[in-house]
Amino acid sequence: ACPLEKALDVMVSTFHKYSGKEGDKFKLNKSELKELLTRELPSFLGKRTDEAAFQKLMSNLDSNRDNEVDFQEYCVFLSCIAMMCNEFFEGFPDKQPRKK
Amino acid sequence: ACPLEKALDVMVSTFHKYSGKEGDKFKLNKSELKELLTRELPSFLGKRTDEAAFQKLMSNLDSNRDNEVDFQEYCVFLSCIAMMCNEFFEGFPDKQPRKK
């Protein structure tokens, strides 16, 4: 598979790797989300491991307010991180592909 | 980097690999989008290479109606594909992680 197709596959499989641990197997509860972030997105998390930060993040992702993060909410989250990465990327011209 | 972080990096770098070819270097025009889809998401495209299908897809992605696809619109598109993959994934219990 092409790199982008592999990337999408990783997005899906990573979600289910953690959503399948407790409760609803198609949703991430707070502890599952915490584990996913700690293990799979350590660069995003950095040192923000305090409880309030996790609660805020969970609340921001949980648009339907069911105390869990479903796959659509997770995709929105990853898109937000990708957009942050993109802003960083666009801010460093020497790291960009050739100019048009 | 962890697989999910690599996946996000691929999302960003793939966009710029094609957006950097013509016109606005931070947006995909129709020909750039067509090339990205053909080369990077062949499984998604399948045999849908007719012009009308591309025009329709471009129109659906171009939410701000500027005839180009910016990074946010591209992320929405990838999220939609990921959600389709996820529906497929959830439909095959034998391919899922262990039950809760």
Epitope: G23, K30, A52, Q55, K56, M58, S59, N60, S63, N64, R65, D66, N67 | -
Partner: antibody, heavy 120, light 107 residues
Framework: QVQLQESGPGLVKPSQTLSLTCTVS?????????WNWIRQHPGSKLEWIGH???????NYNPSLKNRLSMSRDTSKNQFSLKLSSVTAADTAVYYC?????????????WGQGTLVTVSS | DIQMTQSPSSLSASVGDRVTITCRAS??????LNWYQQKPGKAPKLLLY???RLHSGVPSRFSGSGSGTDYTLTISSLQPEDFATYYC?????????FGGGTKVEIK
């Protein structure tokens, strides 16, 4: 200390639109919280109306959804409620509340409430 | 919608008494249960969230327990300022719903 203050007319005629505004002070109107409307009917029953939160995400009580509209103005630290086609059954004390980001999303701060009477 | 049923609807007690109020949900609410106290003419105030976590500034005589569909609020030693109406509320799913209230009166 977070404070919420409801404002709006205390008397609304049947079939008209009830409009209320809540002003938040002592806390920036941040994305970390959802901002709610809750009403209490004369018999003391509490009813959740709806809320507005992260990225402008809005959820309404399905029982009121087709008559409801909520919005916010972050520059003024305000959020608003509009309830159309009111009847006597909409007579209640209306509270604006802040929904915490903790487990179960409790309502941790409340306005003092404003009585709205629907009568001709 | 999830229905919340409180019992009793009212009770009489004396200062120093141990008081227990129960709340039953129509389905499992996974401990996402909050309790509020309301005095006449005032807005409700948060006491406990997520079944048993005390909101800041709430005295430790208030405690909560339960799981699944059945939850309890306990006041270990009733104080004069505790005479009020108590409401449970589920935070498990939308729409948020409240119990009918339990009025605690002086015996």
């Amino acid at each position: 200390q977070v404070q919420l203050q409801e404002s709006g007319p205390g008397l609304v005629k049947p079939s008209q639109t009830l409009s209320l505004t809540c002003t938040v002070s002592g806390d920036s109107f941040t994305n970390d919280y959802y901002w709610n409307w809750i009403r209490q009917h004369p018999g003391s029953k509490l009813e959740w109306i709806g809320h507005i939160g992260y990225g402008g995400n809005i959820n309404y009580n399905p029982s009121l959804k087709n008559r409801l509209s909520m919005s916010r103005d972050t520059s003024k630290n305000q959020f608003s409620l509009k309830l159309s086609s009111v009847t006597a059954a909409d007579t209640a004390v209306y509270y604006c509340t802040r929904e915490s980001f903790y487990d179960g999303y409790p309502f941790d701060y409340w306005g003092q409430g404003t009585l709205v009477t629907v009568s001709s | 919608d999830i229905q919340m049923t409180q019992s009793p609807s009212s009770l009489s007690a004396s200062v120093g008494d141990r008081v227990t109020i129960t709340c039953r949900a129509s389905q499992d609410i996974r401990n996402y249960l909050n309790w509020y106290q309301q005095k006449p003419g005032k807005a409700p105030k948060l006491l406990l969230y997520y079944t048993s976590r005390l909101h800041s500034g709430v005295p430790s005589r208030f405690s909560g327990s339960g799981s699944g569909t059945d939850y309890t609020l306990t006041i270990s030693s009733l104080q004069p300022e505790d005479f009020a109406t108590y409401y449970c509320q589920q935070g498990n799913s939308l729409p948020r719903t409240f119990g009918g209230g339990t009025k605690v009166e002086i015996k």
